[in-house]
Interface confidence: medium
């Protein structure tokens, strides 16, 4: 059985303050069943950025329809970027359960924020 891969192709992304940032993430397999969540930072201090299952994440939209059958693209777009959004973002696969169990994280994409040109 091939090991699940969580692929974040870009190591870094740079956007101007006020613009939108696209953070790409794909998984190599639909198995095991379970959600994808996005975090900024790693370890216990990480921030939950997007969780399709629950919560309201007004500045984040899924690039592809995550509810579509056989979807393997879990890329997100964050709008109206500010300097406080800078950091490394991780796409993390969970196995469905009670609670869900973290399986594998992508390598991370570092978001840097440039001052908006005047």
């Amino acid at each position: 059985e091939e090991e699940l891969q969580v692929i974040q192709p870009e190591k870094s992304v740079s956007v101007a303050a006020g613009d939108s940032a696209t953070l790409n993430c794909t998984v190599s397999s639909l198995i095991p069943v379970g959600p994808i969540q996005w975090f900024r930072g790693a370890g216990p201090g990480r921030e939950l950025i997007y969780n399709l299952k629950e919560g309201h994440f007004p500045r984040v939209t899924a690039v592809s329809d995550p509810t579509k059958r056989n979807n393997m693209d879990f890329s997100i777009r964050i709008s109206n970027i500010t300097p406080a959004d800078a950091g490394t973002y991780y796409c993390v696969k969970f196995r469905k359960g009670s609670p869900d169990v973290e399986l594998k994280s992508g390598a991370g994409t570092e978001l840097s924020v440039r001052a908006k040109p005047s």
Epitope: P44, R46, G55, R59, D85
Partner: antibody
Framework: DVQLVESGGGVVRPGESLRLSCAAS????????MNWVRQAPGEGLEWVSR????????DYAESVKGRFTISRDNSENTLYLQMNSLRAEDTAVYYC????????????WGLGALVTVSS | ETVLTQSPATLSVSPGERATLSCRAS??????LAWHQQKPGQAPRLLIY???NRATGIPDRFSGSGSGTDFTLTISGLQTEDSAVYYC??????????FGGGTKVEIK
């Protein structure tokens, strides 16, 4: 409807401790960062502390750093503020406030809990 | 650290008139500015976010404008229940989160 209800306020002497609680309902508590904001009598609003959705990331105002500890229990939908080495200048109404997203404004506020530090 | 300066400190307006409140940031905060209303003895309530967007349930007599460093909250057709202190909050740079010193709106 989102509801935030603080409890645990009271009168203490300088140097003593107090723990505030904020019971949350009406939203997915574990998905949101939460904050404490205080207001001294007749004064404006002062941000005190923030905790991220998972509970592992915290920030504090310089005025309370090393004395106050913010924490949360996502299984109980409750936010806490442990206040040690209290000073007269900590006298205030303490509000818990929900954050709109991880990097955002405060969209819901509790009714507040009065903390009085007096000898 | 970003400092928010609100003016005037107190504003006295007759019912039905327009109230204009100012909030100035010491450095750009983009559009990341919110306005909160606090009535006497009550908790603050969110009015405006991202400089111009009204929060859920807020009457359309409240409007926000501005970006960068200069922001305005306008209350058109002031009603007696609008008597309150109004605070601006920036969330472009943090921590710490910063509030302005407040503007007290009194009804003449």
């Amino acid at each position: 409807d989102v509801q935030l209800v603080e409890s645990g306020g009271g009168v203490v002497r300088p140097g003593e401790s107090l723990r505030l609680s904020c019971a949350a309902s009406g939203f997915s508590f574990s998905s949101y960062a939460m904050n404490w904001v205080r207001q001294a009598p007749g004064e404006g609003l002062e941000w005190v502390s923030r905790i991220n959705s998972g509970g592992g990331g915290t920030d504090y105002a310089e005025s309370v750093k090393g004395r106050f500890t913010i924490s949360r229990d996502n299984s109980e939908n409750t936010l806490y503020l442990q206040m040690n080495s209290l000073r007269a200048e900590d006298t205030a109404v303490y509000y818990c406030a929900k954050q709109y997203d991880w990097n955002g404004f405060f969209d819901y506020w509790g009714l507040g809990a009065l903390v009085t530090v007096s000898s | 650290e970003t400092v928010l300066t609100q003016s005037p400190a107190t504003l006295s307006v007759s019912p039905g008139e327009r109230a204009t409140l100012s909030c100035r940031a010491s450095q750009t905060v983009g559009s990341k500015l919110a306005w909160h209303q606090q009535k006497p003895g009550q908790a603050p309530r969110l009015l405006i976010y991202d400089a111009t967007n009204r929060a859920t349930g807020i009457p359309d007599r409240f409007s926000g404008s501005g970006s960068g460093t200069d922001f305005t909250l306008t209350i058109s057709g002031l009603q007696t229940e609008d008597s309150a202190v109004y605070y601006c909050q920036q969330y472009y740079y943090w921590p710490p989160y910063r509030f302005g010193g407040g503007t007290k709106v009194e009804i003449k």
